[in-house]
Structures are given as C-alpha cells and as structure tokens.
Interface confidence: medium
C-alpha cells in the first residue's frame, strides 16, 4: 500500500555556488489531482523543514529561500527540488516525503565540492643555492572543498613521503586552503611536484618547481628555464620562465634578449641597447623590467589561446650567448558532462536506448571513459567525437548504444589528459516502465 | 623585486570612509593572497583579512567585518582596503602583505589612517 | 582563534649577552606553519625566521629558532646593538592567523 517513492542512490555532487537539483519521483495514479499531494522536503538528521507543497500550492522555502520545487512537472510525479547558490554547509541528507493516499518517502544525499586552485610554488631561500643546501618548497593551492589530498613527487615520478607537512585551512565558507610544506636536501638538480587531489571531483591540480643549483663556470652564458612544459590555461597570464646570472658590474646596457617561437623563429619580444623593444606578438607578450638586472629573463604571455601553444626560445647575448626552448602546453578544462537518453520515456527492459555524453570546451582532445554501475568497462557500441570551435576548443560528444537490463548505471568520464582533469556524469535507469529525465 | 607601493598618510573625519591602495610589482600579482595587517601606535600586529587577487576570494577575521572591505583592481595590480564608519579606535599603521608561501616575506610602507575632526 | 602569549614584553640586555624569547600557542600548532618577524621603530615589520627555527635571507647566523606544539622560542647568542627592535611570533595554521603581542628587545 505504500507509495513508491525514487531517488538517486549515488550522492548529488554539486559546486560549490552552482544549483543542484534534488531528484525525487512518485508515480501518480491516473485522476491524480495536485489538490490530493502533500509533498515535504527536510533535512534528514534534524528534520528541518526545507520545501513544501500542500492544499494544491506551494507553500514556499524554508530553507534561506533558495529552493524551489518543478512546479508544471509536479503533476506528472516530478518532486525533484531545486536548491540554489549551494554553500558548503549545505551538504547532507536531504528526505522527500510523498503523501497522497498513501505515504513514502526517500532520502538523497548531497555532495558538495569546490576545485582548488593550481597551486603555487615558492622556495626559500631562493638564491644562490648549492648542492647539498636544505631549502623549503611550498605548495598552496586554495578555495577548494572538501579537503584535499597532496602527494609530492621527485622529477622521476618517485614519491616523496618524508619532511612533508600540509596544513588545511577552513575559511568562513568553509573552502579549504592548503598549504604543504616539504623540506629537501639539494643534489646537482632536481625537480620537485607537488599534486593537489580534490577526491569527489577527482581532479588533480599540480605544479612542479626544478632547481639548479649553482652554475658551473664556463665559456657560454648559462641560460635557464624549466625542464617540464608550462602548463596555462586559456584566457589566463603565463610565465614563460628564463633565467641568466648575471656577473658584478653587469649593466642592462650589454644585455640582448630575444625570444622567438622555436620552429618558424618568428620574434616574439625583445630587450636590446638598454631598453625594452616591446612586443612583436599580438601586444601580449612582457617582461619584467625591474627583474631583468638579477637575471630574470621571463616572458610573460597575456591571455593565452590554443594558437600559443608550442616551443619559445629564450635567447640571452651578453658577451657571451646562450640560448633555451620552454614548451607552453595549453589547456581548457571540460565542463561537467550533460547525459541525455533516447528514447526517453516508457522504457523497459530489453529495450536499445542511446546515452550520449556531452562535454564542453576543452583542450586538449580529452579521454573518453564509459563504465557500469558495477566500474566494468563499456567499450563495445560507443562512439565519441571531438569538434574543434574557432578557437580551438574541443566539445566532445560521446554516444554508447546499450540493451537496458532490469536496471543500471551508466557512467561516462571525460578526461583532460593535460590537467589530469576528470569530469563525470552518470544516468541510473530504474523501474519500468519509466521516464527520464526525473528532473527539470 | 617585491615591492609594495603604499601612500603615506589619510587624515579622515570621524564616521568617513577611506580606501587605502596598495601597489604590487615584481611578481605575479594574481598568484598569490594579499593581507592586511593594522598597527595601532605602540601596539602589536592584528590580521584583518586576506583577498586572493585572481578569484576575488577573500578570508576576514571575524573582528574586522564590516570594518573592512578587501577589493582588487587586476589591470593595475592594485589591492585595496576600504576602512568605514571611522572613529579614533581606527586610526593606525595599515599595512599590506603578500605571502607567497604561509609566511610574510613582503611588507608594504604602510599607511598611518588618523582619524580626527 | 588560536592566541599567542609572548613573553617577555620587554627585555633590558648588554651587547654580548644570550637572549630567549618564547611564544606560547592556545592550541598546538604545526612547526612548520610558526614564524618570526623584527620590527624596528618607525619601519614595517622584517620577514626573520620561517618555520620555527629557518632564518630568512640575510638574518644574522646568531639568530635561532626552536620549538614544536604549542612552546616556541627565538634566541640570539650574541646581543649586538642593531638587535635592537620588537619581536613578533605568527602563526598561520587556522583562520583567523594571529601574531604575538610582541617582545621588545632593549639595549642598555
């Protein structure tokens, strides 16, 4: 006699100031009447009231007046809840209560998360380094939730356990700063990594910081930039670092600087006969002027695009020459996938439905992953394509074809294979026969 | 190098707003948070709150909302720090820091706010 | 908030002499995230020691730092006259951070 009432299993995962929607259906009997439901959402531990609907209206939020429920779907058992501008202090079970002739009810949990920041790297002391010194390396990374997980790593991949402390710290949002500190003896050169892991969005943030340390006297003028590609993001500033040591007396007046693109040698900016050239790169490109007399030689590249990508060379003339390549890898990270399944309605088992996963703006050509509920692997009957816009970002479109059994998950998670990004969507299908979506 | 530009005085009225500048050169203005820190004469250091130029995201303490209000501009790389409802309790050193790691390696001047009609 | 005590407020010394100075925190705090600043008259507050016993960029080796969880202590082997400034311990492992009241280093 009770009244069916579904929701997700899995948590509802939500960022941190976005809407989420609550899924929550009953399946009205024919002749049902909004006049015969009385429907209730609440905070499951405390039994707070959060959303109501009775007597034939909505009887509004209780919940800081940020929810609101499907008003023209609440007829065809649609009593999903729509929560607005989530907060960290939302997270929880929420229950929705489905009273009409009969009673049921159901609990559906929310997952809060916020992606934290790429983390900065900062290194004391920072000059005159030798092997053999101890220095301390920091790694921040802020404004994420929940707390993160951190993992150092040596420039072979090996991991660094010992002399690391990290420290996570709520602010009155209740995101997370981190910071992570790791203490290491210098040898002749090495490269430090520091990953910062979000585990419910599953996506890595990292940064590395490659020291050398004091240059060995010879004839060239040594020049210096990071061994590993800088990574940028499109739309953002980046800093394509070059370093130089500059010898007593050096005076800005002897120096030529020149950075080109590495294959077609096309110029990009200049310093020569005491004083900045300017860009010859689309007036995006800078140095920093007031860095050059210690020998910081950086370019820094304004409002990256896709087109940027690729080798600069860093050119430094003094009396003697030297000359480096850093690679500037460019990335998008892919939004969250939207999942729509056709056909959509009055589906039953045996039934061949289509599920296609769309994922957008992203670069560089992301990794298409489709599994089960269970994790298995879906690899037959899918097909996935990539569609580069004028800027050259990609949208992904993935397609799998499935026979539905009684029930079943299907997940689909695109991977930025340059940011170690993953952005999943997953769509259950229950009951039979049923329709989807269950939500706006 | 570091440097941290900041005008040398405001004299305000009593129950006046001011906002103080505070000018970032020498490193990646958007990378990394500014602080604010007061100084009343003869006293100790107290942390207002910080502002992550980049996000916009900012961490006060508890004792200075609605005191303070933290802003950016990214085109100058330029923090600010707009101080109301001045009384006497307010006039102080202001300084602003920028840690690059949990440290404040870099001080601004600071500016001396007096408060007086 | 996590407070922390520092004490002496102030401290009369001869050049020459060994001073201690400590920081005591409310609540444990890691060492890594425990820092000092100088600060002299009339000029804003210096970068010293970072995490607990690290001396900043060009601070004097008769500088030192010790501690861990809630006992800090920053100690000079030999006062020299341009020692002479306040002192401020800070910690930066929960929100709000907080500083010292500071220790006033004198010199006779």
């Known amino acids: 006699g009770a009244l069916e009432v579904q929701v997700p299993e899995d948590p509802v995962v939500a960022l941190v100031g976005t809407d989420a929607t609550l899924c929550c259906s009953f399946s009205p009997e024919p002749g049902f009447s909004l006049a015969q439901l009385n429907l209730i959402w609440q905070l499951t531990d405390t039994k707070q009231l959060v959303h109501s609907f009775a007597e034939g209206q909505d009887q509004g939020s209780a919940y800081a007046n940020r929810t609101a429920l499907f008003p023209d779907l609440l007829a065809q058992g649609n009593a999903s809840l729509r929560l607005q501008r989530v907060r960290v202090a939302d997270e929880g079970s929420f229950t929705c209560f489905v009273s009409i002739r009969d009673f049921g009810s159901a609990a559906v949990s929310l997952q809060v998360a916020a992606p934290y920041s790429k983390p900065s790297m900062t290194l004391e002391p920072n000059k005159d380094l030798r092997p053999g010194d101890t220095v301390t390396i920091t790694c921040s990374s802020y404004q994420g939730y929940p707390e993160a997980e951190v993992f150092w790593q040596d420039g072979q991949g090996v991991p660094l356990t010992g002399n690391v402390t990290t420290s996570q710290m709520a602010n009155e949002q209740g995101l997370f700063d981190v910071h992570s500190i790791l203490r290491v003896v210098l040898g002749a050169n090495g490269t430090y990594s520091c990953l910062v892991r979000n585990p419910v969005l599953q996506q890595d943030a990292h940064s590395s910081v490659t020291i050398t340390p004091q240059r060995s006297p010879t004839g060239a003028v040594e020049v210096q930039v990071p061994e590993d590609p800088v990574v940028a993001l499109v739309g953002t500033d980046a800093t394509l670092r070059c370093s130089f040591s500059p010898e007593p007396g050096f005076s800005l007046a002897q120096l030529n600087l020149i950075w080109q693109l590495t294959d077609t040698k096309q110029l990009v900016h200049s310093f020569t006969e005491g004083r900045d050239q300017g860009s010859a790169y689309a007036n995006r490109t800078a140095l920093f002027p007031d860095l050059l007399a210690q020998g910081n030689a950086s370019l820094r590249l304004q409002r990256v695009r896709v087109a940027d990508e690729g080798s600069f060379t860093c050119f430094v003339s003094i009396r003697d020459f030297g000359s480096a390549a850093v690679s500037l890898q460019v990335a998008a990270p892919y939004s969250k996938p939207s999942m729509t399944l056709e056909p959509n309605k009055d589906l039953r088992p045996g039934d061949t439905v289509t599920i296609t996963c769309s994922s957008y703006r992203g670069y560089p050509e992301a990794e298409v992953f489709w599994q089960d509920g269970q994790g298995v692997p879906l690899t037959g009957n899918v097909t996935t394509s990539q569609m580069a816009n004028e800027q050259g970002l990609f949208d992904v479109h993935s397609v799998l074809r499935v026979v539905l059994g009684a029930n079943g998950t299907y997940s689909c998670l695109v991977r930025n294979p340059v940011l170690q990004q993953d952005a999943h969507g997953s769509v259950t299908i229950t009951g039979q026969p049923m329709t989807f979506p269950p939500e706006a | 190098q570091v440097q941290l530009q900041q005008p040398g005085a405001e004299l305000v009225k009593p129950g006046a707003s001011v906002k103080l500048s505070c000018k970032a050169s020498?490193?990646?203005?958007?990378?990394?948070?500014m602080h604010w820190v007061k100084q009343r004469p003869g006293q100790g250091l107290e942390w207002i709150g910080m502002i992550h130029p980049n996000s916009g995201g900012t961490n006060y303490n508890e004792k200075f909302k609605g005191k303070g209000t933290l802003t950016v501009d990214k085109s100058s790389s330029t923090a600010y720090m707009q101080l109301s409802s001045l009384t006497s309790d307010d006039s102080a050193v202001y300084y602003c820091?920028?840690?690059?790691?949990?440290?404040?390696?870099?001080w601004g001047q600071g500016t001396l706010v007096t408060v007086s009609a | 908030e996590n407070v922390l005590t520092q004490s002496p407020a102030i401290m009369s010394v001869s050049p020459g002499e060994k001073v201690t100075m400590t920081c005591r925190a409310s609540s444990s705090v890691s060492s890594s995230y425990l820092h000092w600043y100088q600060q002299k008259s009339g000029a804003s507050p210096k970068f010293w020691i970072y995490s607990t016993s690290n001396l900043a960029s060009g601070v004097p080796a008769r500088f030192s730092g010790s501690g861990s969880g809630t006992s800090y202590s920053l100690t000079i082997s030999s006062v020299e006259a341009e020692d002479a400034a306040t002192y401020y311990c800070q910690h930066y492992s929960g929100y709000p951070l907080t500083f010292g009241a500071g220790t006033k280093l004198e010199l006779r």
């Open positions: 020498g490193y990646t203005f958007t990378s990394y948070w």
């Open positions: 820091v920028t840690s690059q790691a949990t440290w404040f390696a870099y």
